[in-house]
């Protein structure tokens, strides 16, 4: 090995990487919220929808004191790819009716894609525990039905929106622990 | 510019300990992973250990769980690499590397012979 | 042997491009982990070239670019120069292990 000598900075540090993941999450928290409007205008919900096949809300308000960066990111990861999985599955799935917001489906994929390597990054960069927490992934099959995907539609943009609306919370508050 | 600098390295006898230590600088140490990674004489990369930014997850490859220990004091910018009961087949060059790994010192040869 | 697997060695000439693959399995690559990719020049300590499968660190030429679909990625430097001559070590998280993962290596040789 040679003498020492300087590595010049990479792009992005840590901080930096969750303020890009912050930024990411709000852009995505708003196309979410725009693309449920555009559902709720073509397809009126007839009340809440669920998916039993969706992850359970993370973060409740009361709990975002007690919050610790690898938890929040681990969990983050993990209902992201959850969504990320039902958004591919709506797209491949979805049937007539929902071929009118493809466009919009298909870019929330992409920016979900690039949340989730944002994130990634940040925990390689921490060096914080990757793997996933074991959970049964449960099988997506065809919706039973014409008005199946649209209330499947409605469910996953319903719990993305929330998981979204806390993960910015959560990485906020983060922040000042980093 | 950011600097890694190992240190501790030398010639120890099969069985024996040593102690490498990584001096870092030009850059939040304490918001960075860091990692020792060795390469054998004209050998590849091998990854050895991680720790969190805070200290709290460590990790180990399997040809080295039990034997090294690895440790960070984020008030002096310091990476520790506590290696016991060495074997010839622990002869390398040791680098200390930072984040993704972003950046690598130049590393510290350590030869373990009789 | 290694986890990720790498051609040992590739070769091409000046202006040449050249790609080298690197290939994992379900627990690295495949569950979606980054793929980075460095050089290490000779005698010199590795060098991050490319991270997040194919962003590259300021400072590195617009030549190098990687890659990544499905359990395998691959490395691209276009217009060969006689100073890429190095090693080439592709990395991923790999779940198996809790750690990252390096390939085996391949050493390209700029000919002529």
């Known amino acids: 090995p040679g003498p020492p000598a300087g590595s010049p900075r990479v792009s992005s540090d840590p901080r930096a990487d969750l303020d890009s993941a912050v930024l990411l999450t709000r852009s995505l928290l708003a196309d979410t919220r725009q693309l449920a409007a555009q559902m709720r205008d073509k397809f009126p919900a007839d009340g809440d929808h669920s998916l039993d096949s969706l992850p359970t809300l993370a973060m409740s308000a009361g709990t975002l004191g007690s919050l610790q960066l690898p938890g929040v990111l681990t969990r983050l990861r993990v209902d992201l790819m959850s969504y990320l999985r039902h958004v591919q599955w709506l797209r491949r799935a979805g049937g007539p009716s929902l071929k009118t917001l493809e466009p919009e489906l298909g870019a929330l994929q992409a920016r979900l894609e690039r949340l989730l390597r944002r994130l990634q990054l940040l925990m390689s960069r921490l060096a914080l525990p990757q793997a996933a927490p074991d959970q049964p992934v449960i099988p997506l099959g065809p919706p039973a039905s014409a008005w199946g995907s649209i209330r499947a539609a409605h469910a996953i943009l319903g719990g993305l929106h929330l998981t979204l609306d806390w993960a910015v919370r959560g990485l906020l508050l983060l922040k000042t622990r980093l | 510019e950011v600097q890694l600098l190992e240190s501790g390295g030398g010639l120890v006898q099969p069985g024996g300990s040593l102690r490498l230590s990584c001096a870092a600088s030009g850059f939040t140490f304490s918001s960075y992973g860091m990692h020792w990674v060795r390469q054998a004489p004209g050998k590849g990369l091998e990854w050895v250990a991680v720790?969190?930014?805070?200290?709290?997850?460590?990790y180990y490859a399997d040809s080295v769980k039990g034997r090294f220990t690895i440790s960070r004091d984020n008030s002096k910018n310091t990476l520790y690499l506590q290696m016991n009961s060495l074997r010839a087949e622990d002869t390398a060059v040791y680098y200390c590397a930072a984040g993704v790994p972003d950046y690598w010192g130049q590393g510290t040869l350590v030869t373990v012979s009789s | 042997q290694s986890v990720l697997t790498q051609p040992p060695s590739a070769s091409g000439t000046p202006g040449q491009r050249v790609t080298i693959s690197c290939s994992g399995s379900?627990?690295?690559?495949?569950?979606?982990?980054?793929v980075h990719w460095y050089q290490q020049l000779p005698g010199t300590a590795p060098k991050l070239l490319i991270y997040s499968n194919n962003e590259r660190p300021s400072g590195v030429p617009d030549r190098f670019s990687g890659s990544k679909s499905g359990t395998s990625a691959s490395l691209a430097i276009s217009g060969l120069r006689s100073e890429d001559e190095a090693d080439y070590y592709c990395a991923a998280w790999d779940d198996s292990l809790s750690g990252p993962v390096f390939g085996g290596g391949t050493k390209l040789t700029v000919l002529g």
């Open positions: 720790i969190s930014y805070d200290g709290s997850y460590k």
């Open positions: 379900s627990s690295n690559i495949g569950s979606g982990y980054d």
